[in-house]
């Protein structure tokens, strides 16, 4: 808390300008009128205030707007936004996409902070829906934001946004989200040639259906085990031993280390043992020779 002291003679701020960088904390508190600050917030960003000075300015705004800042002030917070806590932001009602963009710009290049997460949450709740413009904005600033959306929300993500997604941005996506994102990625990258296409689509393959995996197996892609282990089990099960061998290329040897983990474990159980033996990896658990395989799920469907 800054002590209340009288403003020295001739120091009363008539406008928010660069001369304020010379003011000590107590001078800013005493000589800057909060209402003046609020009306000239757009100037604050153009002045290299120290963090301590920004604390004083924030304190003045907090006193002026105890119930939360109006959007006219929020839009021009600039680097003062970095001083806000999630609790401060929860008091705001942000409805303008321009305001959202202005504040995301301040945090550009940094990881998503709790402040930004709270801001986005407030914005989406205030709008009542995640429209295309909002999604475009959010995915442009934070491609990783995709994984925090529900499959329903993801359905309105434009394929063009997929180009900005980096592999690590999908790390927290679950299979249901990848089911929605994969077809969009397939569409976005459809004009790329084989090897380039695989590099781009690889991160999204957790949502790929069997037929797409079969098609990839014909293209000498040499999928790594880490990617294979993230594939949908139901998409992997119908693949033949030959198809998996082509899909993984030299990485096929890694199956041995993963034979107890899904989807490899479940896939092994569906393969004929003599087919598995052709890999020469010592994979065990396949269907013994001479056994007939009945697809019970098909039988149930017919009855």
């Amino acid at each position: 808390e800054v002590e209340k002291t009288a403003c020295p003679s001739g120091k009363k701020a008539r406008e928010i300008d660069e001369s304020l960088i010379f003011y000590k904390k107590w001078e800013l508190e005493a000589c800057v009128d909060a209402a003046l600050l609020a009306t000239q917030m757009d100037r604050v960003n153009a002045i290299p205030f120290t963090y301590e000075q920004l604390d004083v300015l924030k304190h003045k705004l907090d006193e002026l707007y105890p119930q939360g800042y109006p959007e006219s002030v929020i839009q021009h917070l600039g680097y003062l936004f970095l001083k806000m806590s999630p609790e401060d932001i929860r008091k705001w009602n942000v409805t303008s996409l321009e305001t959202l963009k202005a504040l995301l710009e301040v945090n550009k290049g940094h990881e998503m902070s709790p402040q930004v997460a709270t801001l986005i949450d407030r914005f989406v709740k205030g709008r009542g829906q995640l429209d295309k413009d909002t999604l475009d904005t959010l995915t442009a600033f934070y491609p990783g934001y995709l994984c925090s959306l529900s499959p329903e929300e993801l359905s309105s993500v434009p394929p063009s946004s997929i180009w900005a997604v980096r592999p690590q941005d999908l790390d927290t996506c679950d299979p249901r989200q990848l089911d929605v994102l994969y077809p969009k990625a397939r569409l976005a990258f459809q004009n790329m040639n084989g090897s380039e296409y695989f590099v781009k689509i690889q991160s999204f393959l957790g949502g790929a259906p069997t037929e797409d995996l079969k098609a990839l197996s014909q293209q000498n892609v040499s999928m790594d085990l880490a990617t294979f282990m993230k594939l949908r089990t139901d998409a992997v099960l119908p693949l033949t031993v030959a198809e998996v061998q082509k899909l993984l290329g030299p990485h096929v040897e890694g199956l041995k280390a993963e034979e107890r983990h899904r989807p490899v474990r479940d896939w092994i159980l569906r393969q004929r043992q003599d087919d598995l033996d052709t890999l020469g990896l010592g994979l065990q658990g396949g269907i013994p020779n001479g056994y007939l395989v009945l697809d019970l799920s098909m039988q149930e469907a017919l009855s």
């Epitope: 001739g10 660069e18 001369s19 960088i21 010379f22 153009a46 290299p48 205030f49 120290t50 963090y51 000075q53 920004l54 680097y79 970095l82 301040v106 290049g109 940094h110």
Partner: antibody, heavy 119, light 110 residues
């Protein structure tokens, strides 16, 4: 056109003080802040502080606090930088530079003043 | 005391493209504009780029600046012999209210 002309080279003994001047012309002297930046031989640039010629307010880099004094004489459009308790490490070229409002940059520089501290 | 980190030297042949990186922190580059200065041998520094990526009039468009997070870079395309100089990045630091410079990068045109 805007010009910043600095005083000539100085040789000082350790413990002494030096006062470098910077005469401005071609613009309203009180309308732009003046910064002082130094550069030791073969080294990089180092910011020392800033003065507002309008009111004389100053802000110094922590490293020079207590040793540097920046002043100005508006009647002759001149800024001064005085550095006391000189040591050999203070041997450097000292530049004055005009601060351009709104962009936090030094748009015009003086030609530099070499200060040599030697016993 | 150097707050912004630059490579000590870079080089390139005439006509080539070179980039000079500048790494800082959230209190300087991360929350303030970046400027670049060019210092030819024996002369005062000259402003090259301001506000992260703006060029003052008279500076050729071969020079461009960019910034992301707490790092900035200067790119020079179509390298010319007269570009041989020291280049400094700089920014205001909000932690202590000082102006900070990088250690400088010597550009050699081969």
């Amino acid at each position: 056109q805007v010009q910043l002309v600095q005083s000539g080279a100085e040789v000082k003994k350790p413990g002494a003080s030096v006062k470098v001047s910077c005469k401005a012309s071609g613009y309203t002297f009180t309308g732009n802040y003046i910064n002082w930046v130094r550069q030791a031989p073969g080294q990089g640039l180092e910011w020392m502080g800033i003065i507002n010629p309008h009111g004389g307010d100053t802000k110094y880099a922590q490293k020079f606090q207590g040793r540097v004094t920046m002043t100005r004489d508006t009647s002759i459009s001149t800024a001064y930088m005085e550095l006391s308790s000189l040591r050999s490490e203070d041997t450097a070229v000292y530049y004055c530079a005009r601060w351009h409002h709104g962009t936090w940059i030094f748009d015009y520089w003086g030609q530099g003043t070499l200060v040599t501290v030697s016993s | 005391d150097i707050v912004l980190t630059q490579p000590p030297s870079v080089s390139g042949a005439p006509g080539q493209r070179v980039t000079i990186s500048c790494s800082g922190s959230s209190s300087n580059i991360g929350s303030n504009y970046v400027s670049w200065y060019q210092q030819l041998p024996g002369t005062a520094p000259k402003l090259l780029i301001y506000n992260d990526n703006q060029r003052p009039s008279g500076v050729p468009d071969r020079f461009s600046g960019s910034k992301s997070g707490t790092s900035a870079s200067l790119a020079i395309t179509g390298l010319q012999s007269e570009d041989e100089a020291d280049y400094y990045c700089s920014s205001w630091d909000r932690a202590d209210g000082s102006y900070v410079f990088g250690g400088g990068t010597k550009l050699t045109v081969l």
